[in-house]
Interface confidence: medium
Amino acid sequence: EEELQVIQPDKSVLVAAGETATLRCTATSLIPVGPIQWFRGAGPGRELIYNQKEGHFPRVTTVSDLTKRNNMDFSIRIGNITPADAGTYYCVKFRKGSPDDVEFKSGAGTELSVRAKPSAPVVSGPAARATPQHTVSFTCESHGFSPRDITLKWFKNGNELSDFQTNVDPVGESVSYSIHSTAKVVLTREDVHSQVICEVAHVTLQGDPLRGTANLSETIRVPPTLEVTQQPVRAENQVNVTCQVRKFYPQRLQLTWLENGNVSRTETASTVTENKDGTYNWMSWLLVNVSAHRDDVKLTCQVEHDGQPAVSKSHDLKVSAHPKEQGSNTAAENTGSNERNIY
């Protein structure tokens, strides 16, 4: 009679993570008598996967009833596959012996490859805000995918970015992989509404890439421009001076009026107007009683924006001359309307 052969017909099997893998194995003879075992890997370091004789195998089931006398099908199913299950599986026939069974013949092996989806990309930006014209770095991470081949792209408002560096780890063979990418983005004043997108494409995603996003509103700081203007006389001895704070982001802003260097009033921006580009405008008024001053008055509008060093703009109010409309010129645009007549 021809000697028993162990046949593993599938050289390789590809399974998606979470699914069930079927590893096929048949013997060509019932002789010699002895159990079948399945191992992952070969040699002394192999891992026992299934033992016909004894053991507890919660994820492994046999395809046919191994207790039947004439059974020659030793195929198994492994449930809830993870990338850690990848490897070459050998179906091994043992010959009954005393005291120990003896390995008799092994199948050629079936390589189990596991396809695992990458995790949703997580995009993170710099810890501190930056101003327009500065370059900031964004990172994108995704984990747990297999096989190793993966494509990552960066976009800003739908436009693909080119200044980025990507690494896939580990470099060698592994059950699953991670990707880490860093992109450099130059900020502009119009970026309050902008978005940076990291897009990951992998064979497991069937052409529907995963995306992670970061809003540049979390990253950008647009410093304000200031303009101080003297308004027409409201009463014989009163002059209205306005400080227009334009195009700033985020909203956190504190304004202080100084008269000849002395603090007159401090207020926090509350009722702001929003520009189309997402920046804000705000206006503060100061009513000055010129009869209380003998000499010319230097009025300063000092603004502290988002915890940054204060910026200021001054206006000289001539007391000797009859108050006329005067002002300092800076580009005016889309004024706000927080009108507070406080002296």
Partner: nanobody
Framework: QVQLQESGGGWVQPGGSLRLSCEAS????????MGWFRQAPGKEREFVAG????????YYADSMKGRFTISRDNAKNLVYLQMNSLKSEDTAVYYC?????????????????WGQGTQVTVSS
Amino acid sequence: QVQLQESGGGWVQPGGSLRLSCEASGRTSSSLDMGWFRQAPGKEREFVAGISRTGISAYYADSMKGRFTISRDNAKNLVYLQMNSLKSEDTAVYYCAAALTFRGSDLPRDSNYWGQGTQVTVSS
């Protein structure tokens, strides 16, 4: 080289439960079959339970089947032995073992690495 440290032993009444833990350091335990042996006073060391490196297969000595459960957490390099319905004859020093050695299809007979052991006493 692998270092193994057992914990969780102690005194328990018959019918009670204990959970033993074994922490592996040195070589990654996820590349090794691991298990538990025990040695009662005046007796030889005997196999209790074993688990393959990924946890896909486990094996138990007959007298422990249904009462003991072995499991592992490769991320933490830990192996556990949950012991329920304990009997006085389970009193022994329990040893964690790594790189179990098999012969044929029998249960593990030996190991390449051993812990110091943790005492389990079952008495009323």
